[in-house]
């Protein structure tokens, strides 16, 4: 059977079940020190 679980970040629909956000945010980083 064929599956289509990936999605485009252009899509207004979030990922169905790929497990990844449609346009992941950059993780915030703390300054060293």
């Amino acid at each position: 059977s064929e599956t289509t679980t990936g999605t485009s970040s252009n899509s207004s629909q979030s990922t169905s079940n790929s497990g990844l956000a449609p346009n992941p945010t950059n993780a915030t980083t703390k300054a060293a020190g």
Partner: antibody
Framework: EVNLEESGGGLVQPGGSRQLSCVAS????????MNWVRQSPDKGLEWVAQ??????????RYVDSVKGRFTISRDDSENTVYLQMNNLRAEDTGIYYC??????WGQGTTLTVSS | DVVMTQTPLTLSVTIGQPASISCRSS???????????LNWLLQRPGQSPKRLIY???NLDSGVPDRFIGSGSGTDFTLKISRVEAEDLGVYYC?????????FGGGTKLEIK
Amino acid sequence: EVNLEESGGGLVQPGGSRQLSCVASGLTFSKHWMNWVRQSPDKGLEWVAQIQLKSDNYAIRYVDSVKGRFTISRDDSENTVYLQMNNLRAEDTGIYYCTTGTDYWGQGTTLTVSS
Amino acid sequence: DVVMTQTPLTLSVTIGQPASISCRSSQSLLYSNGKTYLNWLLQRPGQSPKRLIYLVSNLDSGVPDRFIGSGSGTDFTLKISRVEAEDLGVYYCVQGTHFPYTFGGGTKLEIK
């Protein structure tokens, strides 16, 4: 049934190059983001690179440690994703998995970088 | 990067007994669409990882309902209501909310 089959691993000297390939079947390849994830005893599982869809202008992301050395690409007509690896380092050693997201994983291909 | 911390490192469980694995993230995994992209994987010995759960609590096709995912924000749990022999392996949490995607260090489930 979804199948992802990686190839191209092997023994490479530090500073050398290698290209990995992953052929997908059982899914509409052109509708999936494709990723490479690697696994090593030292670092565990580590996401390496991602290539998105034609509708996203094939947007690409890399983990910082491989930027400028690795290049991900895809050929939707051949249902294949590639990882070109240059200037390889000992810390690049590991099993490289092709994945669609977190859902489908290949069996992996082993890369060893050693002199 | 988002740090994913799993506990315990090793879990030794008798068949038929419950098991619980914790996963904590250094930042909230709640995405702007209201979904939380937290996944659980199982890597059996000699095999590649296989996903069990996505979006915190959704079971993948074919995964027994003895696997239960829960949590929110930064604190997540995978529970196995009754461990079976086929459950042995290493369990990983992985977040897909923030770039780069990051994995927990793994929890090895052993059968007593």
